[in-house]
Interface confidence: low
Amino acid sequence: PSGLVTANITDSEALARWQPAIATVDSYVISYTGEKVPEITRTVSGNTVEYALTDLEPATEYTLRIFAEKGPQKSSTITAKFTTDLDSPRDLTATEVQSETALLTWRPPRASVTGYLLVYESVDGTVKEVIVGPDTTSYSLADLSPSTHYTAKIQALNGPLRSNMIQTIFTTIGLLYPFPKDCSQAMLNGDTTSGLYTIYLNGDKAEALEVFCDMTSDGGGWIVFLRRKNGRENFYQNWKAYAAGFGDRREEFWLGLDNLNKITAQGQYELRVDLRDHGETAFAVYDKFSVGDAKTRYKLKVEGYSGTAGDSMAYHNGRSFSTFDKDTDSAITNCALSYKGAFWYRNCHRVNLMGRYGDNNHSQGVNWFHWKGHEHSIQFAEMKLRPSNFRNLEGRRKRA
């Protein structure tokens, strides 16, 4: 015979074809062997011109031989080489599917591999590829979009060889609040680590605001709107700066009166103040807290005290905000100017958390009068807010 070729090669099969001998022959003897694979020999009829090779090992180079027989006579042997495909991984499955994460698992192919190519694609056409090592049989997908259909595919790699892809389809869980309007809704979405989050004022995706969420204090879900901790940020700022906000959300900052107004206009909010000084801690919670709009000069409403720091904010209830360039307090002097800060001053303050850091002169520092008086500047202070009914929501969420 002549012209021995192989076709239709897969990971376990191939088809051998040849040109028949010119003379009539009784049979053809076909043998094939590969590395670490014992030789297999088959005899087929003399009028056959192809033979299906089955049960082959994947990713293996085979040597195929064929000769013709007529009675006791044998023709010369012709040879061809071919390599089987790499077999695919098996049983690709998505488990532990959450709103933004999923775990892909699979069983390895029979052939040895040098790695795997993972491709996952969302319905909107976003495609991501990742190559993982040969001993890996699972991979955690992160940063997925909630309520989204995904197709995940995997392909085994062995040097230049690539297996067929197998795939699985899964859908991420929908977020309870796709556009959380505060840190409590972010928390109810399952985010439980304190840090930077994007919230959406009134749940409007066009009104995005980056905030720091305290997810640990008293059950979490707090938007932090003021932090004093080291004196690096200048809090002696003008009206415009206090309206807009300033500082680094991870460090010392003020979130901004406009933002506070918009947030507290979303519903009923409570205020929490956490204070720390030389290992001592104190807190104050007010179950009704709101900040008016610019027309009211960001008028403060704060009621319903509980805590350990003392009710110093009651003195400021109903007051408008004051800065050195916009004096709205009831004192003869300009409180903000006198105390180098800004606040809902009255005449002038029992609370001065935006005062001069580390200044222990009377009323100049970071003061909470009913805890440390007017002549002690507190080392650490945070003001934060969350919905007043958070406990109720959280309790219902846990129980229902």
Epitope: L176, P178, D204, Q268, N389, R396, R397, A400
Partner: antibody
Framework: EVRLVQSGAEVKKPGASVKVSCKVS????????MHWVRQAPGKGLEWMGG????????IYAQKFQGRVTMTEDTSTDTAYMELSSLRSEDTAVYYC????????????WGQGTLVTVSS | DIQMTQSPASLPTSVGDRVTITCRAS??????LNWYQQKPGKAPRLLIY???TLQDGVPSRFSGSGYGTDFTLTISSLQPEDFATYYC?????????FGQGTKVEIK
């Protein structure tokens, strides 16, 4: 599993009041957000009022304001809906339903109570 | 108050059909929308909450989509037990109004 069992059918005269009860089992009433929905014969669903976790209070649809009172007896885990000054158009099946988690979706429903207002 | 408008009011259809019901809110309600199914003489049953989240035990042929003011309930392949009336409900803020209902009936 929450189960809501409502009181039986009532026939009332125009101008009278009716009080429908809804007994909760499987959970305590304090753990749930109770709502009332009615459905006139051959008509759609009409939300009457219920506990709004957002405000922490019971709110009523404008249409029923002043005529409806929703109360709870936590000692017996029973909710009540009282509708006064009844008129013929108040003939309907009245359902109690509880809201799921903080999604406010009405997950569990009573079997309904038919209130007929007729002279 | 937020008004909810469903269309169509009735939908003659056959088993195996793909069914789409729309619901429009008179104001922006984000994704705060529920869908219910009601059969004659029975209490309503929650199908989908938060616009697209399938309630436990509801077959996957039901799906919800939409955001803001326009929402859709889809039944990918109608089954005999799906002939019923479907209602959308605003859950953005009280009063939590329902749509007027869409009756899916046999053609």
């Amino acid at each position: 599993e929450v189960r809501l069992v409502q009181s039986g059918a009532e026939v009332k005269k125009p101008g009278a009041s009716v009080k429908v009860s809804c007994k909760v089992s499987g959970y305590t009433l304090t753990e749930l957000s109770m709502h009332w929905v009615r459905q006139a014969p051959g008509k759609g669903l009409e939300w009457m009022g219920g506990f709004d976790p957002e405000d922490g209070e019971t709110i009523y649809a404008q249409k029923f304001q002043g005529r409806v009172t929703m109360t709870e007896d936590t000692s017996t885990d029973t909710a009540y809906m009282e509708l006064s000054s009844l008129r013929s158009e108040d003939t309907a099946v009245y359902y109690c339903a509880t809201a799921q988690k903080e999604t406010y979706a009405l997950t569990y429903w009573g079997q309904g109570t038919l209130v007929t207002v007729s002279s | 108050d937020i008004q909810m408008t469903q269309s169509p009011a009735s939908l003659p259809t056959s088993v195996g059909d793909r069914v789409t019901i729309t619901c429009r809110a008179s104001q922006y309600i984000q994704g705060f929308l529920n869908w219910y199914q009601q059969k004659p003489g029975k209490a309503p049953r929650l199908l989908i909450y938060a616009a697209s989240t399938l309630q436990d035990g509801v077959p996957s042929r039901f799906s919800g989509s939409g955001y803001g003011t326009d929402f859709t309930l889809t039944i990918s392949s109608l089954q005999p037990e799906d002939f019923a009336t479907y209602y959308c409900q605003n859950q953005y803020r009280g009063p939590w109004t329902f749509g007027q209902g869409t009756k899916v009936e046999i053609k």
